[in-house]
């Protein structure tokens, strides 16, 4: 903290300009009026202030706005945003998407910091839901943003927002998150025709149930192996050899390379060896001929 001293004669700042970079910390504290700083925040971004000087400017704003900065100041924080703590940001009420964009721009190219995460959380909570424009903005800056949300948070994403999601935005999502997103995507893309629908829904299929995979197998979609490997194991297991063959189309040959990995490995264990042999891929590990398969889960359900 900079100790309070009187501003030297002739050094009182009349505007926020480059001359201030030559002030010592105590001179900035003494000679820059916080209200002037607040009205000319947009200028700070263009001036090569040091870390220490930015600390002083932040301190002045903190004193002026102990309950949190108004949005008119927040929008122009620029590099000063990087000095804010999550505690500071929790005091803010950010409602404008332009403000959000301005602050995300400052952090561009860096990992999502606790400050940014707090800012996004405040913004989304203020809006009540993750609308399409917000999602567009967030995934543009942070492609992995969607997968950083909990399934509970994802449940507030309206289906209309799913149109903004790109395949790379889902790269780090786990099955629990895809379970929530898939039904929304299915709803969002329901009016599209077969091939277009598959292109859009493909990234979300890690959350698809068996019946939807069966339906897709009837549509000549030619799912690639990378997508197949991301499907839920429990959704793949009930599929027949014929259904998997139709689902993968020419990509079915890729099963051989993946036979030791889930879900292919577990699926092979559930198929009759006779059926697997029809693929001509040399897949081994199926149920030998003459063995009876008891579906214990079905038996439990009946009792």
């Amino acid at each position: 903290e900079v100790e309070k001293t009187a501003c030297p004669s002739g050094k009182k700042a009349r505007e926020i300009d480059e001359s201030l970079i030559f002030y010592k910390k105590w001179e900035l504290e003494a000679c820059v009026d916080a209200a002037l700083l607040a009205t000319q925040m947009d200028r700070v971004n263009a001036i090569p202030f040091t870390y220490e000087q930015l600390d002083v400017l932040k301190h002045k704003l903190d004193e002026l706005y102990p309950q949190g900065y108004p949005e008119s100041v927040i929008q122009h924080l620029g590099y000063l945003f990087l000095k804010m703590s999550p505690e500071d940001i929790r005091k803010w009420n950010v409602t404008s998407l332009e403000t959000l964009k301005a602050l995300l721009e400052v952090n561009k190219g860096h990992e999502m910091s606790p400050q940014v995460a707090t800012l996004i959380d405040r913004f989304v909570k203020g809006r009540g839901q993750l609308d399409k424009d917000t999602l567009d903005t967030l995934t543009a800056f942070y492609p992995g943003y969607l997968c950083s949300l909990s399934p509970e948070e994802l449940s507030s994403v309206p289906p209309s927002s799913i149109w903004a999601v790109r395949p790379q935005d889902l790269d780090t999502c786990d099955p629990r998150q895809l379970d929530v997103l898939y039904p929304k995507a299915r709803l969002a893309f329901q009016n599209m025709n077969g091939s277009e629908y598959f292109v859009k829904i493909q990234s979300f299929l890690g959350g698809a149930p068996t019946e939807d995979l069966k339906a897709l197998s009837q549509q000549n979609v030619s799912m690639d192996l990378a997508t197949f490997m991301k499907l839920r194991t429990d959704a793949v297991l009930p599929l027949t050899v014929a259904e998997v063959q139709k689902l993968l189309g020419p990509h079915v040959e890729g099963l051989k390379a993946e036979e030791r990995h889930r879900p292919v490995r577990d699926w092979i264990l559930r198929q009759r060896q006779d059926d697997l042999d029809t693929l001509g891929l040399g897949l081994q590990g199926g149920i030998p001929n003459g063995y009876l398969v008891l579906d214990l889960s079905m038996q439990e359900a009946l009792s």
């Epitope: 030297p8 050094k11 480059e18 030559f22 001179e27 971004n45 202030f49 590099y79």
Partner: antibody, heavy 119, light 106 residues
Framework: EFQLQQSGPELVKPGASVKISCKAS????????MNWVKQSNGKSLEWIGI????????SYNQKFKGRATLTVDQSSSTAYVQLNSLTSEDSAVYYC????????????WGQGTSVTVSS | QIVLTQSPAIMSASPGEKVTMTCSAS?????MHWYQQKSGTSPKRWIY???KLASGVPARFSGSGSGTSYSLTISSMEAEDAATYYC?????????FGAGTKLELK
Amino acid sequence: EFQLQQSGPELVKPGASVKISCKASGYSFTDYNMNWVKQSNGKSLEWIGIINPNYGTTSYNQKFKGRATLTVDQSSSTAYVQLNSLTSEDSAVYYCARGGYDNEAMDYWGQGTSVTVSS
Amino acid sequence: QIVLTQSPAIMSASPGEKVTMTCSASSSVSYMHWYQQKSGTSPKRWIYDTSKLASGVPARFSGSGSGTSYSLTISSMEAEDAATYYCQQWSSNPPTFGAGTKLELK
């Protein structure tokens, strides 16, 4: 150990441009501003400008504004000054100098780069 | 811009002699900094914030002053002190340097 290593001497023709580099080591490059200073033949020193390596923000001496451009490359911890439309008046030694904490002068200087403008 | 006038431009001193050089500013400045430069080398920060000695600077050096008048003093001249000394203000935009005082060994 702190070090500012500048690029070698330059011989350039009038009207041409020159770009001088200054590679910093031994400290966190983005934590301190970098200054550039001109020293004409055995004469005094002239401040050209300053750059914040973290944000790329700059401030120039009005005399050099428009002809000098300060930039940085964070990945290599290197600062640059580019001088355009050179005349014989620009023949000098150019120094990069780190801005000291809380404006405590320029605490570390590069070894200097000699620029000679001659046809 | 603030003009800094150093005097004398050139001076010589014998070993053990007290040396004082001055720097006068055309307008008041908060602090004055001093740099030492020897022939063919880059300047070194010598005294900063008017009176603080930079790391490695012998205690025989001192700095003082305020407003428009500042000085650098060597209590007892030594051969290694022969160099040019520049004053510099960092209070006003742009920072400026004095023309230097060349100190020679008598």
